[in-house]
Amino acid sequence: NYANGKNNVPRLKLSYKEMLESNNVITFNGLANSSSYHTFLLDEERSRLYVGAKDHIFSFNLVNIKDFQKIVWPVSYTRRDECKWAGKDILKECANFIKVLEAYNQTHLYACGTGAFHPICTYIEVGHHPEDNIFKLQDSHFENGRGKSPYDPKLLTASLLIDGELYSGTAADFMGRDFAIFRTLGHHHPIRTEQHDSRWLNDPRFISAHLIPESDNPEDDKVYFFFRENAIDGEHSGKATHARIGQICKNDFGGHRSLVNKWTTFLKARLICSVPGPNGIDTHFDELQDVFLMNSKDPKNPIVYGVFTTSSNIFKGSAVCMYSMSDVRRVFLGPYAHRDGPNYQWVPYQGRVPYPRPGTCPSKTFGGFDSTKDLPDDVITFARSHPAMYNPVFPINNRPIMIKTDVNYQFTQIVVDRVDAEDGQYDVMFIGTDVGTVLKVVSVPKETWHDLEEILLEEMTVFREPTTISAMELSTKQQQLYIGSTAGVAQLPLHRCDIYGKACAECCLARDPYCAWDGSSCSRYFPTAKRRTRRQDIRNGDPLTHCSDLQHHDNHHGPSLEERIIYGVENSSTFLECSPKSQRALVYWQFQRRNEDRKEEIRMGDHIIRTEQGLLLRSLQKKDSGNYLCHAVEHGFMQTLLKVTLEVIDTEHLEELLHKDDDGDGSKIKEMSSSMTPSQKVWYRDFMQLINHPNLNTMDEFCEQVWKRDRKQRRQRPGHSQGSSNKWKHMQESKKGRNRRTHEFERAPRSV
């Protein structure tokens, strides 16, 4: 039973401190007068990450975000006062929170902010070439930001700028009630979704917008919006949220009479991300949080990755679902949702669908309609009253590719990298959470490439304090991940092969597609490198198959066994600490009696209790003396991490030792302690103290006493000897290690 549930835990769990110590994270901890580093724009060509925040826009160097330029773009005092008088929070709302940051042309960006509840936009000059090093605000040219940025900083905008036109899904009013999808800028009249019609949009929250070609003809290009919204009455009993994908044609210019300056090609469909329940009722993950499009060889068919959470406050869960654009298109070509019947329920529309089918882009490909203004009235009227599709879009394989329900966090962001490995291509997901951690997950095929299983490689804490990750970008060029939150921006490498260990088996067990054993170390795998020594097994992570011929090599180069001697007292308790770096590894203990070769597996019971951190031996007996071997077993591969020699001192012997007059010769103590290392002496002394303090019921209470005593001594004697200081340092490290999973990467015995 101990093994169950281990597959769902991250193999490695790295704290923020560990990330810093191992140089695996670079953080920009924000400015005192700014926050909300939520709006990202990655520019691989210039090697810059542009970040929109409160009253600021930053340009970070992709190589190292410590190197950055900034533009200060606050609101005027007048605007701020107006905002305050409107009853808004001066710090959290009455500022210019940047919500839109898009590449406008070769030399400029387009930026929009909330402007203290008075949306505003402008252009930012970035120059033609990276070496121009230009980053300045065009403060002579400000534009109205209505329909581009929300008024309220709590709301998001999904934006996309193509061919000089800005597509944005946002709230267009002060109250945050008039939500719409807009197209502004450019030479044409602004276009928007129908107003005050809940069939079109019902209190949506926009996530992102993407241009996806429909055919080889650019006239057929569509812009897809991802959002979540309230389910329309009759669609669901009670108040519910639905995740949606919406489409509009890039060449939609509105209708000629009806839907003038409104989208005529807008359609939306529900995105399902659910798991079947035991009682036949599915558990739905409806709160769409983020979307990532993984481009394929065919630009018409990217894979859509969506991050979802549950709506329920009782049951908290997160899921990742994958969708294919062919499935999306199939739904948009399917039946329209239509309200009919005595109960006014939503049913599939059975009547005649006008031609050209509503939602089809006017083009030469489909019937020669030159413009949406040319569409006949029946198409427009049908489009106006039937914006929703009846069928939902189901995920690939009809289920999520990853679910997390047993944790205290929820997913918020996702980026995906396609990695070439020895045995094929793997998609590595980096998932941001609402507690400031990033999960690194790889999709591995079980029997076939269609049936995927998720392997949680790492859980990394990237911010000092728990904070919601609100933005993520991945640079394939730099092989770096960039993460945004209210607190700041973090940067981390996509791969850190050296952390897995110094042996082939450890590299293989990691199952990281970025890494392979190169014959001497675990390093970045490059498919172009024609080296037969590359060992990698992402699919199975089986070191026995891939590293069996290197076992001798591993032992030679790999870790040497850590050995310890511990002294315990009869009838007292002692704790043998051993926790492998990998949380997937199962710990297996063996006991070898003194002067015996035979090793036996330790049976658990009242006398011996296994914990996550090691073995607790209660009520020690003389027969417990001997060697305790701690092995880590993972994927059939066993490695010995630690050998502890336990010496149990009988009570009589102890009494004799303790009652020796200090002035006496004390030879027995000297004899016993002469063979001990400084740290062992400390352990011995502490165990003596534990026995003499029956009030200290637990190891924790005992440690607390020891630490308090140490602090007191340090305060009283600032000039205490070097020897004493070293002793304590050693002891603190030993104790500290108990609660640590993956500290000290160089500590060989733990590196499984």
Partner: antibody, heavy 117, light 107 residues
Framework: EVQLVESGGGLVQPGGSLRLSCAAS????????MSWVRQAPGKGLEWVST????????YYPDSVKDRFTISRDNSKNTLYLQMSSLRAEDTAVYYC??????????WGQGTTVTVSS | EIVLTQSPATLSLSPGERATLSCRAS??????LHWYQQKPGQAPRLLIK???QSISGIPARFSGSGSGTDFTLTITSLEPEDFAVYYC?????????FGGGTKLEIK
């Protein structure tokens, strides 16, 4: 001034074919949907066909579908109606009409088609 | 297809009187209804578009109302030249259909 002049009507035997033409002037022909509407002797109006601006698609009622074909030549400002497999019930005055996307705002004077043996 | 029913089939009134013509659709067509006038030996001409929108060159005494399924054409004070056949037509969906017509004759 908008003008629509139909031609090509006449007497034809059942099963026969006829091609009607409509010369348009006084407006930008290529900017409008065009339609044909007919009226049988002593009867009401019946919509026959509509073609979109580019000529790339046309609409028909079931009564004439697969027998009549509407077409246009925007370079010549001319609308056509090719009628085949004609029946006695196709006897009518055929009007060339501007519109069909919305209302039909201008009508020609009509051309008479008689199908009789 | 959408069927349009006009009533009455014949309406006999004197010049100067008010004429009210009705057109009922078999299903809701919004305001996608147009009215035409046809005099003997002439082509029809558009009077009202989209249920109530007037057409330039058409006298102000002609007005339209209604939406959904019930529509009305009103001629406030009949002139001698107004006596003709009036047709309604729906442009809501293909196939486009016309009503059977109302013949307005001099009493």
């Amino acid at each position: 001034e908008v003008q629509l002049v139909e031609s090509g009507g006449g007497l034809v035997q059942p099963g026969g074919s006829l091609r009607l033409s409509c010369a348009a002037s006084g407006f930008t022909f290529s900017s409008y949907y065009m339609s044909w509407v007919r009226q049988a002797p002593g009867k009401g109006l019946e919509w026959v066909s509509t073609i979109i601006k580019s000529g790339g698609y046309a609409y028909y009622p079931d009564s004439v579908k697969d027998r009549f074909t509407i077409s246009r030549d925007n370079s010549k400002n001319t609308l056509y109606l090719q009628m085949s497999s004609l029946r006695a019930e196709d006897t009518a005055v055929y009007y060339c009409v501007r519109g069909g996307q919305g209302a039909m705002d201008y009508w020609g004077q009509g051309t008479t088609v008689t199908v009789s043996s | 297809e959408i069927v349009l029913t006009q009533s009455p089939a014949t309406l006999s009134l004197s010049p100067g009187e008010r004429a009210t013509l009705s057109c009922r659709a078999s299903q809701s067509i919004g305001d996608y209804l147009h009215w035409y006038q046809q005099k003997p030996g002439q082509a029809p001409r558009l009077l009202i578009k989209y249920a109530s929108q007037s057409i330039s060159g058409i006298p102000a005494r002609f007005s339209g109302s209604g939406s959904g399924t019930d529509f009305t054409l009103t001629i406030t004070s009949l002139e001698p030249e107004d006596f003709a056949v009036y047709y309604c037509q729906q442009g809501y969906s293909f196939p486009y259909t016309f009503g059977g017509g109302t013949k307005l004759e001099i009493k």
